[in-house]
């Protein structure tokens, strides 16, 4: 069964800046990755970035840089300032759409006791 993993890390240099990394463990052709916060994209979450392997990347504030790390993993850096900046207990979710298996998603957040720079 395919699985999705999510890591959330607060940057040591910018304490309100986050890096989210997500990966897909499974076969099939990854068609789209959707990163959201505040819950899954289909359950009230707000989309931060959409990554398509052929048609490119779309991102919305406070997302600063979304990119493919490998064919089956992505990373997203969030800006650390402004009214829409994330807080330490924000939930981030990644949804991988793989053809023809379907969609698989997982969520993660920064552990309450995490020091800056440690991965969740």
């Amino acid at each position: 069964t395919p699985e999705v993993w999510v890591q959330v890390r607060m940057e040591a240099t910018e304490l309100s800046s986050f890096t989210i990394r997500c990966g897909f463990l499974g076969s099939g052709s990854i068609s789209l990755v959707t990163v959201s916060w505040g819950g899954p994209n289909g359950a009230g979450g707000t989309t931060l970035a959409v990554l398509h392997p052929e048609r490119g990347i779309r991102q919305w504030a406070p997302a600063r840089q979304a990119r493919w790390e490998t064919q089956s993993s992505i990373s997203l850096i969030l800006e650390g300032s402004g009214a829409s900046s994330p807080c330490a207990n924000t939930t981030f979710c990644c949804k991988f759409a793989s053809f023809p298996e379907g969609s698989w998603e997982a969520c993660g957040s920064l552990p309450p006791s995490s020091d800056p720079g440690l991965s969740a």
Epitope: N41, R55, K95, A97, P100, G102, S103
Partner: antibody, heavy 120, light 107 residues
């Protein structure tokens, strides 16, 4: 304008074979996942085969597995469905359809369909 | 397999009135739900994708809502050209599955 045109349907005896074709135009065929969906007379819709845009991943339900084979020729902008060991219950209109990644794999374009009748 | 169950099987609504079609999934399908309209002798046409997004050219009297396992297609003011069979569809998990269809007629 996106166009999908099916051909190859007809009357065939039980145990016989048919090859359906779908000619695509108006879009970059190689960038899309494609499917065959059938509809028996007066009945609902059933996905009978799907193929990923790279051609590496395919799907068949148990009802047709081992009998139907989906393939694509991106140079010819064509989708195919080879149907062997046909049964009376395979009688249906067969539609070629295109999946849109950005729409959660919804099928945003359909052909007019080709009728396959399996009868002795 | 995820089973999509539509209700009602058929529906008769007066012109200008609201029509509501429900679709229940046997398990959560996130937001990967679409609705199609099929008129006699024609292929299905995409109306709604991602639960509530109208496809290009679809009149705004059509709307979709819901989450998780329960979804609804609403036609706010029925027009004569809306007479058709409507299907819900989930593309969350293979195999993609459709509802059995709801036949919409004018009362």
């Amino acid at each position: 304008e996106v166009q999908l045109v099916e051909s190859g349907g007809g009357l065939v005896k039980p145990g016989g074979s048919l090859r359906l074709s779908c000619a695509a135009s108006g879009f970059t065929f190689s960038s899309y996942h494609m499917s065959w969906v059938r509809q028996a007379p007066g009945k609902g819709l059933e996905l009978v085969s799907a193929i990923s845009r790279d051609g590496d991943s395919t799907y068949y339900p148990d009802t047709v597995k081992g009998r139907f084979t989906i393939s694509r020729d991106d140079a010819e902008n064509s989708l195919y469905l080879q149907m062997n060991s046909l049964r009376a219950e395979d009688t249906a209109v067969y539609y070629c359809s295109r999946h849109e990644d950005y729409f959660g794999f919804a099928m945003d374009s359909w052909g007019q369909g080709t009728l396959v009748t399996v009868s002795s | 397999d995820i089973v999509m169950t539509q209700s009602p099987d058929s529906l008769a609504v007066s012109l200008g009135e609201r029509a509501t079609i429900n679709c229940k999934a046997s398990q959560s399908v996130s937001n990967d739900v679409a609705w199609y309209q099929q008129k006699p002798g024609q292929p299905p046409k995409l109306l709604i994708y991602y639960v509530s997004h109208r496809f290009t050219g679809v009149p705004d009297r059509f709307s979709g809502s819901g989450s998780g396992t329960d979804f609804t297609l609403t036609i706010s003011s029925l027009q004569a050209e809306d007479v058709a069979v409507y299907f819900c569809h989930q593309a969350y998990r293979s195999p993609w599955t459709f509802g059995q269809g709801t036949k919409l007629e004018i009362k």
